[in-house]
């Protein structure tokens, strides 16, 4: 999906109002320097591409993020403010239902959400720098 035509201001507002709090709640208790910064993004569409990938693409050591509250809200936000996004996700959702796993917060998942915080931060800040 090409995130170029999204309403970035509306996505920012949704992130600051709800998604950020769910991410923080998920990370609560972790140490600041537990996880290295390994993922970055350079502009708003690129940030959203990376955010979508980390949030919704299961990895061998972290399969369950898509069912977390912050992921559900991220999906709703992208569907609302990115034209045609929800249509592109129908097939992906069907595939995800087939490989649903028991929900476990692993260290690898915490590391992934730590990267998400960094990506969202860049998304918001890139937006501010453009204004």
């Amino acid at each position: 999906y090409d995130f170029t035509n999204c309403d970035f201001q509306k996505i920012e507002a949704d992130y600051l109002r709800t998604i950020s709090k769910d991410l923080i709640t998920y990370m609560s208790g972790t140490k600041s320097t537990d996880f290295n910064n390994t993922v970055s993004c350079s502009n708003r569409p690129h940030c959203l591409t990376e955010i979508q990938s980390l949030t919704f693409n299961p990895t061998p050591r972290c399969a369950s993020l898509a069912k977390e509250m912050f992921a559900r809200k991220t999906k709703a936000t992208l569907a609302l403010w990115c034209p045609g996004y929800s249509e592109t996700q129908i097939n992906a959702t069907q595939a995800m239902k087939k490989r649903r796993k028991r929900k476990v917060t692993t260290n690898k998942c915490l590391e992934q959400v730590s990267q998400l915080l960094g990506l969202w931060r860049r998304f918001i800040r890139t937006l501010l720098k453009k204004q």
Partner: antibody, heavy 118, light 107 residues
Framework: QVQLVQSGAEVKKPGASVKVSCKAS????????MHWVRQAPGQRLEWMGE????????DYNQNFRGRVTITVDMSASTAYMELSSLRSEDTAVYYC???????????WGQGTLVTVSS | DIQMTQSPSFLSASVGDRVTITCKAS??????VAWYQQKPGKAPKLLIY???MRHTGVPSRFSGSGSGTEFTLTISSLQPEDFATYYC?????????FGQGTKLEIK
Amino acid sequence: QVQLVQSGAEVKKPGASVKVSCKASGYTFTSYLMHWVRQAPGQRLEWMGEIDPSDSYTDYNQNFRGRVTITVDMSASTAYMELSSLRSEDTAVYYCALTGTINYFDYWGQGTLVTVSS
Amino acid sequence: DIQMTQSPSFLSASVGDRVTITCKASQDVVTAVAWYQQKPGKAPKLLIYWASMRHTGVPSRFSGSGSGTEFTLTISSLQPEDFATYYCQQYSSFTFTFGQGTKLEIK
């Protein structure tokens, strides 16, 4: 162990610029964010900005935007904070501090006193 | 920016006393609050993060609590080395802000 060692005290005239350094050791320099926080006499701590050494991405507190520039020298594992157009209110102790993506500060430099006086 | 308001600004107490410092955020910061101790001429030292987690090496007499907009730092039994200035900080928003500080003095 992680160590952040800052440059020495500076005295500057109003309108001038100052550049403070922070040499990092004891960890992989590109792994964490480097922040700058200042404290004017009797005032609260004030976050100025940060840099991600892995790609030199910077982010600044809007109160300082346009006056502060944070850079890194990868080969020397050193971060720099330059503040321009100095005024007397910029007299403060300037600290570098380290975080991951979660931004509370578990490692600090020893501080650098910058005095702005005519 | 989110404002962090500490109270009291000054606090006089004696060794062995139990003291509580309060920090109020101008909007919901969930539990993204840290507490620092600072002594004259020194850098701040992290005491508490995530509102209630003690940093490595911090004595058990220091505890933190709270969520949303109201947070407290409690020292259960003051020791001579605890007389210092204490700051809260929120890291929920993207511009990190600190309280104005609470100076804890010997009565």
